[in-house]
């Protein structure tokens, strides 16, 4: 029950996160004109990954797409790439996780397959979230650098008395949406990976069977099964797969292939 809840919650959190990453990528307000300590302008500038916009106090808004690819700063291209990679990985992760959900039955899919898919989607969500956080952070760093550069020469003298105001840009709403969304996707991914552990059948869980040969004492050997020191035709340690159920004989549990998360 707890596993199903963890998996379901991880899925929902990741879904919200990826929706947020998509929203942030599409938003125009990655950077907005800094209004602090600036003359009151009747024009407000803001920029996104794909276009820049100008909103006039009259209410008229005009947006222009960046129709050049080569003319754009490398950092902006990198941010675009990170966000797109994040969205693609997240989308694939969502698709995989839908089929991995414990509450959804698809044919005769085994729990081990669901565990694998849950782990895969979890890892995808983690990478997706990290891509979004990295993309937003790179952009934020770019803004901070440019902000202080433009502050240094905020007013550029033009012929003595005439001055031109340098437009400075600060963090836009999309950055905060991106950070939160990336964080949610990351958390969702971690939850999926945790859920995967609960879904994974213990492949090396064996019912301990002891065989008694007359006149010999039974020696208890650690290692998940009891071994006999008796003679006879069946002195081999017999391994019986218990299908995931544990007996009180099992003192030591073995790491399964999903335990490295």
């Amino acid at each position: 029950m707890a596993v199903t809840a963890c998996q379901g919650l991880g899925f929902v959190v990741s879904l919200i996160g990826i929706a947020g990453i998509i929203a942030a990528t599409c938003m125009d307000q990655w950077s907005t004109q800094d209004l602090y300590n600036n003359p009151v302008t009747a024009v407000f500038n803001y920029q996104g990954l794909w276009r820049s916009c100008v909103r006039e106090s009259s209410g008229f808004t005009e947006c222009r797409g960046y129709f050049t690819l080569l003319g754009l700063p490398a950092m902006l291209q990198a941010v675009r790439a990170l966000m797109i990679v994040g969205i693609v990985l997240g989308a694939i992760g969502l698709l995989v996780s839908i089929f991995a959900l414990k509450c959804i039955r698809i044919g005769s899919m085994e729990d081990s397959a669901k565990a694998n898919m849950t782990l895969t989607s979890g890892i995808m969500f983690i990478v997706s979230g990290l891509c979004a956080i990295a993309g937003v952070s790179v952009f934020a760093n770019m803004l901070v650098t440019n902000f202080w550069m433009s502050t240094a020469n905020m007013y550029t003298g033009m012929g003595g008395m005439v001055q031109t105001v340098q437009t400075r840009y600060t963090f836009g709403a999309a950055l905060f949406v991106g950070w939160v969304a990336g964080g949610l996707t990351l958390i969702g991914g971690v939850m999926m990976c945790i859920a995967c552990r609960g879904l994974a059948p213990e492949e090396t869980n064996y019912k301990a069977v002891s065989y008694h040969a007359s006149g010999h004492s039974v020696a208890y050997k650690p290692g998940g099964f009891k071994a006999s020191t008796g003679f006879g035709s069946n002195t081999k340690n017999k391994k019986i797969y218990d299908g995931g159920a544990r007996t009180e004989d099992e003192v030591q549990s073995y790491p399964s292939k999903h335990d490295y998360v």
């Epitope: 024009v43 106090s57 009259s58 001055q163 105001v165």
Partner: antibody
Framework: EVQLVESGGGLVKPGGSLRLSCAAS????????VSWVRQAPGKGLEWVSS????????YYADSVKGRFTISRDNAKNSLYLQMNSLRAEDTAVYYC???????????WGQGTSVTVSS | DIVMTQSPSSLSVSPGERVTISCKSS????????????LAWYQQKPGQPPKLLIY???TRESGVPDRFSGSGSGTDFTLTISSLQAEDVAVYYC?????????FGAGTKLELK
């Protein structure tokens, strides 16, 4: 057809108050920024105040700040200018205008005359 | 506040002649976001409210004859009437539309010679 009709002007004593109104029609008033501009007799144009659409930010000329208040009623398609502590230098024709592309004032009313005199 | 300096203050021109009116602002009216200059030109005939001619320094308002044109960038702007008509006799104002307060120039009175 866009129409802006001012009213409320008249003769008032110094220190007195007056409320100008502007009835707008022919365009989506709630989506438009609107302004008041005045012109003293035989003088040039002087921007007085603006109010934006949406959150309704207000802006004032230094000469009227603290004395004049611009407001709007989108339900009535009306713009107002509450003028307090009037001075002789406030005597002018007051125009109601619509701000559009480039923040330019593309439509103007015929104006209402305000005279401040003892 | 932004100071708008118009010149000349008055002008007497013969019909058919080319007219140029200058307007200088104390700060640049160029917005880096869209590379547009926030300056407007108005025409006011006696007894009438002003009429918008040009916005964004060079964009002609609809219905304005093409003999009117605006040019300039940053701080220096010009209104040109390519061939003066009798009905163009008026006072012309430039206005800063970039910074509040939205200041006007003192005006240029255009008369027929």
């Amino acid at each position: 057809e866009v129409q802006l009709v001012e009213s409320g002007g008249g003769l008032v004593k110094p220190g007195g108050s007056l409320r100008l109104s502007c009835a707008a029609s022919g365009f989506t008033f709630s989506n438009s920024a609107v302004s008041w501009v005045r012109q003293a007799p035989g003088k040039g144009l002087e921007w007085v105040s603006s109010i934006t659409s949406g959150v309704s930010y207000t802006y004032y000329a230094d000469s009227v700040k603290g004395r004049f208040t611009i407001s709007r009623d989108n339900a009535k398609n009306s713009l107002y200018l509450q003028m307090n502590s009037l001075r002789a230098e406030d005597t002018a024709v007051y125009y109601c205008t619509r701000q559009f592309k480039g923040n330019a004032l593309d439509y103007w009313g015929q104006g209402t005359s305000v005279t401040v005199s003892s | 506040d932004i100071v708008m300096t118009q010149s000349p203050s008055s002008l007497s021109v013969s019909p058919g002649e080319r007219v140029t009116i200058s307007c200088k602002s104390s700060q640049s009216l160029l917005n880096s976001g869209n590379q547009k200059n926030y300056l407007a030109w108005y025409q006011q005939k006696p007894g009438q409210p002003p009429k918008l001619l040009i916005y964004w320094a060079s964009t002609r308002e609809s219905g304005v004859p093409d003999r009117f044109s605006g040019s300039g960038s940053g701080t220096d702007f010009t209104l040109t009437i390519s061939s003066l008509q009798a009905e163009d006799v008026a006072v012309y104002y430039c206005q800063n539309d970039y910074f509040y307060p939205l200041t006007f120039g003192a005006g240029t009175k255009l008369e027929l010679k």
